[in-house]
Amino acid sequence: LYFSRDAYWEKLYVDQPAGTPLLYVHALRDAPEEVPSFRLGQHLYGTYRTRLHENNWICIQEDTGLLYLNRSLDRSSWEKLSGRNRGFPLLTVYLKVFLSPTSLREGECQWPGCARVYFSFFNTSFPACTSLKPRELCFPETRPSFRIRENRPPGTFHQFRLLPVQFLCPNISVAYRLLEGEGLPFRCAPDSLEVSTRWALDREQREKYELVAVCTVHAGAREEVVMVPFPVTVYDEDDSAPTFPAGVDTASAVVEFKRKEDTVVATLRVFDADVVPASGELVRRYTSTLLPGDTWTQQTFRVEHWPNETSVQANGSFVRATVHDYRLVLNRNLSISENRTMQLAVLVNDSDFQGPGAGVLLLHFNVSVLPVSLHLPSSYSLSVSRRARRFAQIGKVCVENCQAFSGINVQYELHSSGANCSTLGVVTSAEDTSGILFVNDTKALRRPKCAELHYMVVATNHQTSRQAQAQLLVTVEGLYVAEEAGCPLSCAVSKRRPECEECGGLGSPTGRCEWRQGDGKGITRNFSTCSPSTKTCPDGHCDVVETQDINICPQDCLRGSIVGGHEPGEPRGIKAGYGTCNCFPEEEKCFCEPEDIQDPLCDELCREQKLISEEDLGGEQKLISEEDLHHHHHH
């Protein structure tokens, strides 16, 4: 048995007479032989579930579900109840109604075995019948909505009449009917005004019925019509077996360059017209088992279950259903020497499905794991300026298909043929398994005899000891110009274009910093700033060379504080900034502020405290102290 609603609403007035019928609660059957028996909870509750008093006023007919006043609720009773409502005005009280043989213990009131009946309390007597508006004569203030389980026996789930009105205003005639009801599985009996289902409902055919209840009031000569929505939701049960959309039960996949743990190798989709079990229970009750194969397969693969709600069309309306994606996933990184082909089977079981038929499917995955060879081009040739600063990125080396690699470890090394001309370093980029070539020793660049640098690039996969080699020829170009000792180590310090371009900084390939002019559009990714090379900094990503020294590109790499209008990067740096952003790496601070700010104005602001407000900068409010702006505003 279950209630057709989880909450009912009615009005209560002071001194309403004993015997006044209040409302009916309705139970629907899960099985044809069930007979409902209703029981009221012992207590009345108020605001915030406050237990107010034992219920001495309202009774229920156990067999019909009719609630009525057993004794009148007078003012003194009401004041007694109000006094216990934690100081809140008592506007609403509620009772719990239980369906026997559900738990006899009065605890949590949860649908389907319990419903709450709310009474809006009016500290006046019942109004004169002639003063009641048609809306008040027809329907409760709170619109009802109904829940009916699919595949269950039909039954009565609502009674239209407002019983207190009918009882206290017998001369007013009220008639009801359901619009949209014809051809649908609902019926409103003209005599009893009970609404019932004509037959068992099927959620997979229709999940929501948006009906309209029409009430016609006859009071003397006048006739008025009131319409309200009358929504019915059909509740699901596990009555549909899982199926393969378009009959596809097999997926084939090749594992080659993507060999990283957690890589999705292949996906098969299962469709289930049901939306139960609910999400909390789903993974426990909808099981998938990788059928035993060899040990290698069991260790290497796992199956992940990803259920998702979807909508399907049925009889002209949309109903919810579930698609289950079963992903075959790598359980570990695969060695580049691994080479095998296998078939895997996965058993999917909808354990709640009761039939007819089986709730079990078999999924098939055909997987080929191919070995990966390491190849480099026969040679590389590039140039570097004598003025290049330490950490300047001058090129990349990359084994064949390295951009596509994941889970394949390749380490690059440089072996120099001229011991005193070992200028470059190489680091492996985690993003694309390439090797980034950068200037490591500027002293060697300055030596006249180091005009051509010869290296052997070696790419190694340490797990298998497989290697690839290539020649690298680097031509050193231009004349060395001594860097000015007064120039900041970091290009990012400079706040204006002229001072930016007259200095170099760590990471600068030309020995000069570059100015990036922003677009001036509020807090933007394209903020103005000074950079060692606008190709790499800032680009919203702290790359493997930039991580070696915070002075190279604090705009991408700073973990400190950013003052002014900005959006912080994830996990560090400036994702977006307002106006011009400059940084002081040793102080672990960056500042973003409008581009047109004049020094005298800034000096003036620094004497007090500088408030960069939400209106000015579009960001969070930041208070910048004189301490923060020391050095910054002058530089």
């Epitope: 001594a482 000792a485 900041p488 180590l489 310090v493 790496p585």
Partner: antibody, heavy 119, light 107 residues
Framework: QVQLVESGGGVVQPGRSLRLSCEAS????????MHWVRQAPGKGLDWVST????????YYSDSVKGRFTISRDNSKNTLYLQMNSLRAEDTAVYYC????????????WGQGTLVTVSS | DIQMTQSPSTLSASVGDRVTITCRAS??????LTWYQQKPGKAPKVLIY???TLERGVPSRFSGSGSGTEFTLTISSLQPEDFATYYC?????????FGQGTKLEIK
């Protein structure tokens, strides 16, 4: 607050060695370049040596090149000056000074330690 | 190396006077110049950096100007505590050099 404290000075004979230390506190030492500057009694200031914040680059005045070595231990927040083959003209008060990478002038100085080279 | 020449070597003045010390570089050092004040037995103290930027906490009666090869330090109204030796220092080249100093004495 920023503090630089030099130690290791004293009287030493010509040709001998001495090692000066400068202990830093009140700032993130590893982020700053450091310098040694000396001042002979009654004379002006004379730059001796510079080391980058990460120890990657060193510079020396011609008068000490090949004899003095600057070094740093960022884990101990300490700057060193190893002085070998000392001469009478190396007699001076030796100051360590801090160099913020964003501004590059010598913004904080220690109180100095006196080195006297005399037979 | 870049030579830094300061003038005068000695300067006598009274409290309230306006004084100017000059520093000349043997080649352009743009604005990479610092002015220090030193009192006997003490470490030098920064007054001005980058030729004209007043160091935090330094009284506004001190000001610096110039760029390239000619630089000046001005004290607008001498106070008793200003009598000391003043040094200019170029940090344009890694062979850092200092001026020989200007001793400011009470007249």
């Amino acid at each position: 607050q920023v503090q630089l404290v030099e130690s290791g000075g004293g009287v030493v004979q010509p040709g001998r060695s001495l090692r000066l230390s400068c202990e830093a506190s009140g700032f993130t030492f590893r982020n700053y370049g450091m310098h040694w500057v000396r001042q002979a009694p009654g004379k002006g200031l004379d730059w001796v040596s510079t080391i980058y914040y990460d120890g990657s680059d060193e510079y020396y005045s011609d008068s000490v090149k090949g004899r003095f070595t600057i070094s740093r231990d960022n884990s101990k927040n300490t700057l060193y000056l190893q002085m070998n083959s000392l001469r009478a003209e190396d007699t001076a008060v030796y100051y360590c000074a801090r160099d913020p990478p964003s501004f590059r002038y010598f913004d904080y100085w220690g109180q100095g330690t006196l080195v006297t080279v005399s037979s | 190396d870049i030579q830094m020449t300061q003038s005068p070597s000695t300067l006598s003045a009274s409290v309230g006077d306006r004084v100017t010390i000059t520093c000349r570089a043997s080649q352009s050092i743009r604005s990479w110049l610092t002015w220090y004040q030193q009192k006997p037995g003490k470490a030098p103290k920064v007054l001005i950096y980058k030729a004209s930027t007043l160091e935090r906490g330094v009284p506004s009666r001190f000001s610096g100007s110039g760029s390239g090869t000619e630089f000046t330090l001005t004290i607008s109204s001498l106070q008793p505590e200003d009598f000391a030796t003043y040094y200019c220092h170029q940090y344009s080249s890694y062979s850092y050099t200092f001026g020989q100093g200007t001793k400011l004495e009470i007249k």
